[in-house]
């Protein structure tokens, strides 16, 4: 759920790492209300996720490792 490219709330689903090609981080500021990880999926969807949740942290860590290896 996003408005002007801001996440307004978090997904209530868990995504598998195989579904995700990358992510961006949204920081709460004057433009956006909440901190979020925006996952980009193989289907071209952007999914807003809670950066505090374990499954989100795990995928971010996994993707960050991949990027660092390149």
């Amino acid at each position: 759920a996003s408005n002007f490219d801001c996440c307004l709330r978090y997904t209530d689903r868990i995504l598998h790492p195989k579904f995700i090609v990358g992510f961006t981080q949204q920081l709460a500021n004057e433009t956006c209300d909440i901190n979020a990880v925006v996952f980009h999926t193989k289907k071209g969807l952007s999914v807003c996720a809670n950066p505090k949740q374990t499954w989100v942290k795990l995928i971010v860590r996994r993707l960050s490792k991949k990027i660092n290896k390149m």
Epitope: H16, K18, F19, K42, Q53
Partner: antibody, heavy 120, light 107 residues
């Protein structure tokens, strides 16, 4: 070794609630998810929902929202599922199962299941 | 929700034969698929994870393959001990969904 202990059976009246337990041992409880799965007699498996014991984050199959409530007690390494407003459709075996995100999000250990019978 | 369709629903084969069970997803699940074996009166057991990886303690006579929307489980040199119901499961995105199951019997 990893064990998930569930009570064998629960007999409950229509309209009542039941809270079943799943005691985990042999691993660090907060490092793995706990899923709950339903199996009605002669039917397939249905995923109810999952709880992350590290932060109590839950997500449910839409079909079971309002029916099932998942909780954990990390001090006793026990997961719970409460089912409310029971009907004959809720008569089934309910399994707790460990979710392992290190093994492709698979359910790698299962409890023996709790058989719930809803009958007056 | 992603729908999982398993076939056949039941299967009878002789000891020593090779059998294949198929599982189709309603959309691409990118290999996020697991297989479980449930023997009569027992809890399900993880058999294959990530479409192709054999779970610890399971016989190497079991193998998984597939990608995209189509997956299969092959059981080589069938043993009487393989009598069970087999389920595939999508774990790409919640709600995780199971196939209807394939009941394997020995002739």
């Amino acid at each position: 070794q990893v064990q998930l202990q569930q009570p064998g059976a629960e007999l409950v009246k229509p309209g009542a609630s039941v809270k079943m337990s799943c005691k985990a041992s042999g691993y660090t409880f907060t490092n793995y998810w706990m899923h709950w799965v339903k199996q009605r007699p002669g039917q397939g498996l249905e995923w109810i929902g999952v709880i992350d014991p590290s932060d109590s984050y839950t997500t449910y199959n839409q079909k079971f929202k309002g029916k099932a409530t998942l909780t954990v007690d990390t001090s006793s390494s026990t997961a719970y599922m409460q089912l409310s407003s029971l009907t004959s459709e809720d008569s089934a075996v309910y399994y707790c199962t460990r979710g392992n995100y290190g093994v492709d999000y698979a359910m790698d250990y299962w409890g023996q299941g709790t058989s719930v019978t809803v009958s007056s | 929700d992603i729908q999982m369709t398993q076939s056949p629903a039941s299967l009878s084969a002789s000891v020593g034969e090779t059998v294949t069970i198929t599982c189709g997803a309603s959309e691409n699940i990118y290999g996020a698929l697991n297989w479980y074996q449930r023997k009569q009166g027992k809890s399900p057991q993880l058999l294959i994870y990530g479409a192709t990886n054999l779970a610890d303690g399971m016989s190497s006579r079991f193998s998984g393959s597939g990608s995209g929307r189509q997956y299969s489980l092959k059981i080589s040199s069938l043993h009487p001990d393989d009598v069970a119901t087999y389920y595939c499961q999508n774990v790409l995105i919640t709600p995780y969904t199971f196939g209807g199951g394939t009941k394997l019997e020995i002739k």
